[in-house]
């Protein structure tokens, strides 16, 4: 029973002045708390039915309570409409009047919220962005809504979180909940694996040219996952790029221009949610010399009866380090002149009159001569010579 024995001692003085101790034992009933006091700090969980779009309020109490006008079964108040207040009068035989009047401030419907991946695709290898979106309107006071995220051991009280500087290809678990007046009414839990990261830089072993038209590059691949390589080679302002198979560790470059500096860049890439390029490794070489191309637009013009002016345009491809023009003049098969100038501009004097000459102009780049450009031209008779006519009578 609720009654229990309470022994109380009283001490009184007798007329003689001696102390008399009398003990009385009485049965008392302790006063019950009021239900208002007992359930003052009652907490509630809201459960949502996606079919009926109604909430159930689960009262977090240890005993089965009565709910006044609102019937409650197993401490649950059913069929509550979102964003509407419901008053519940909580009573139990362990407590007395007044009852606890609990105002149920019903949250908005769960489907009004959606957890959205707000990660930028370019950054999906090292970031996670999650954001709760309101996708439908509701009448609840938005000031009363709070959001909570927990990713690993990090906790955030925001509607949106952004985790940065994460490891690529790593798994993260993020739990989130939405509270209305500090009552949780929906939650979500996401497993997220960050995207492939940019591959590392390949390590170039060597990069050289041992011929005029060829070069070679060899490398070690990067450590991280990748799909293929891109090899670019740049000469002056021209750039050519090739897509190379991921298993290659060597590439022979063909059809290069002689005596030309080539800058090579090699990077690995991976096609993930977007293409991610790794850092490029750079190297350079200069191809070997080769014979220059032919001079062009060669002209031979007479400046006098036995003098010629020979000119030509530089070759399109010098293919070597130096610049020198040569002119060979032949009469028959005999070399009569051999001149060399910095420019293709030769004045050939004191040739034989009325003679056929072959003029051969070519470019020399310091290593190789080019094909000669050949023209034939004849000198005139000597127009200045005095002719004496003898008349026989």
């Amino acid at each position: 029973s609720d009654a229990y024995l309470n022994a109380s001692e009283t001490t009184t003085l007798s007329p003689s002045g001696s102390a008399v101790i009398s003990t009385t034992t009485i049965a008392t009933t302790p006063s019950k708390p009021t239900c208002d006091e007992k359930y003052a700090n009652i907490t509630v969980d809201y459960l949502y039915n996606k079919e009926t779009k109604l909430f159930t309020a689960k009262l977090n109490v240890n005993e089965n309570v009565e709910c006044g006008n609102n019937t409650c079964t197993n401490n649950e108040v059913h069929n509550l409409t979102e964003c509407k207040n419901a008053s519940v009068s909580i009573s139990h035989n362990s407590c007395t009047a007044p009852d606890k009047t609990l105002i149920l401030d019903v949250p908005p419907g769960v489907e009004k919220f959606q957890l959205h991946d707000c990660t930028q695709v370019e950054k999906a290898d090292t970031t996670i962005c999650l954001k709760w979106k309101n996708i439908e309107t509701f009448t609840c006071d938005t000031q009363n809504i709070t959001y909570r995220f927990q990713c690993g051991n990090m906790i955030f009280d925001n509607k949106e979180i952004k985790l940065e500087n994460l490891e690529p290809e790593h798994e993260y678990k993020c739990d989130s909940e939405i509270l209305y007046n500090n009552h949780k009414f929906t939650n979500a839990s996401k497993i997220i694996k960050t995207d492939f990261g940019s591959p590392g830089e390949p390590q170039i072993i060597f990069c050289r040219s041992e011929a005029a038209h060829q070069g070679v590059i060899t490398w070690n691949p990067p450590q991280r996952s990748f799909h293929n390589f891109t090899l670019c080679y740049i000469k002056e302002t021209e750039k050519d790029c090739l897509n190379l198979d991921k298993n290659l560790i060597k590439y022979d470059l063909q059809n290069l221009k002689p005596y030309t500096k080539y800058v090579l860049s090699l990077h690995a890439y991976i096609i993930a949610k977007v293409q991610r390029n790794g850092s490029a490794a750079m190297c350079h070489f200069t191809t070997k010399s080769a014979p220059p191309s032919q001079v062009w637009n060669m002209t031979v013009s007479m400046t006098s009866d036995n003098s010629m002016h020979v000119k030509c345009r530089p070759p399109r491809d010098r293919n070597g380090p130096h610049e020198r023009y040569h002119l060979e003049v032949e009469a028959g098969n005999t070399l009569v002149r051999n001149e060399s100038h910095k420019n293709c501009d030769f004045r050939v004097k004191d040739l034989q009159y009325s003679t056929d000459y072959t003029f051969k102009a070519y470019f020399h780049n310091g290593d190789y001569p080019g094909e000669p450009f050949i023209l034939h031209h004849s000198t005139s008779y000597n127009s200045k010579a005095h002719h004496h006519h003898h008349h026989h009578h």
Partner: nanobody
Framework: QVQLQESGGGLVQTGGSLTLSCVAS????????MGWFRQAPGKEREFVAA????????YYADSVKGRFTISRDNAKNSVYLQMNSLKPEDTAVYYC?????????????????????WGQGTLVTVSS
Amino acid sequence: QVQLQESGGGLVQTGGSLTLSCVASGGTFSSYAMGWFRQAPGKEREFVAAIGGSGDSTYYADSVKGRFTISRDNAKNSVYLQMNSLKPEDTAVYYCQADPTMFHKLYYGINPNEYDYWGQGTLVTVSS
């Protein structure tokens, strides 16, 4: 929203194996992470396994790790759950679910209340 149809359940002895299939229709299959949930009699629905859109990332509940393997065939719009070393506590109705993955290798909701629509599921019974 993709429609999902599970199949492959049945009765199997403890220690036995079974492969469940789930075919999806409507939507671009490869843009969804796919997963399996299960609900044992009288218990809450729980997460089992998930796989990313391209099939190169997987995640498992601790209770099935090392025994179950999730895989997918994007050409067939299908996801599979290979279940080995089955135990009586694996007895449940198994459901598959799709979660749109935009940017990560894997992005999947492991909380059943995140999903609005559920298929019929396929029943797996493991007898002892």
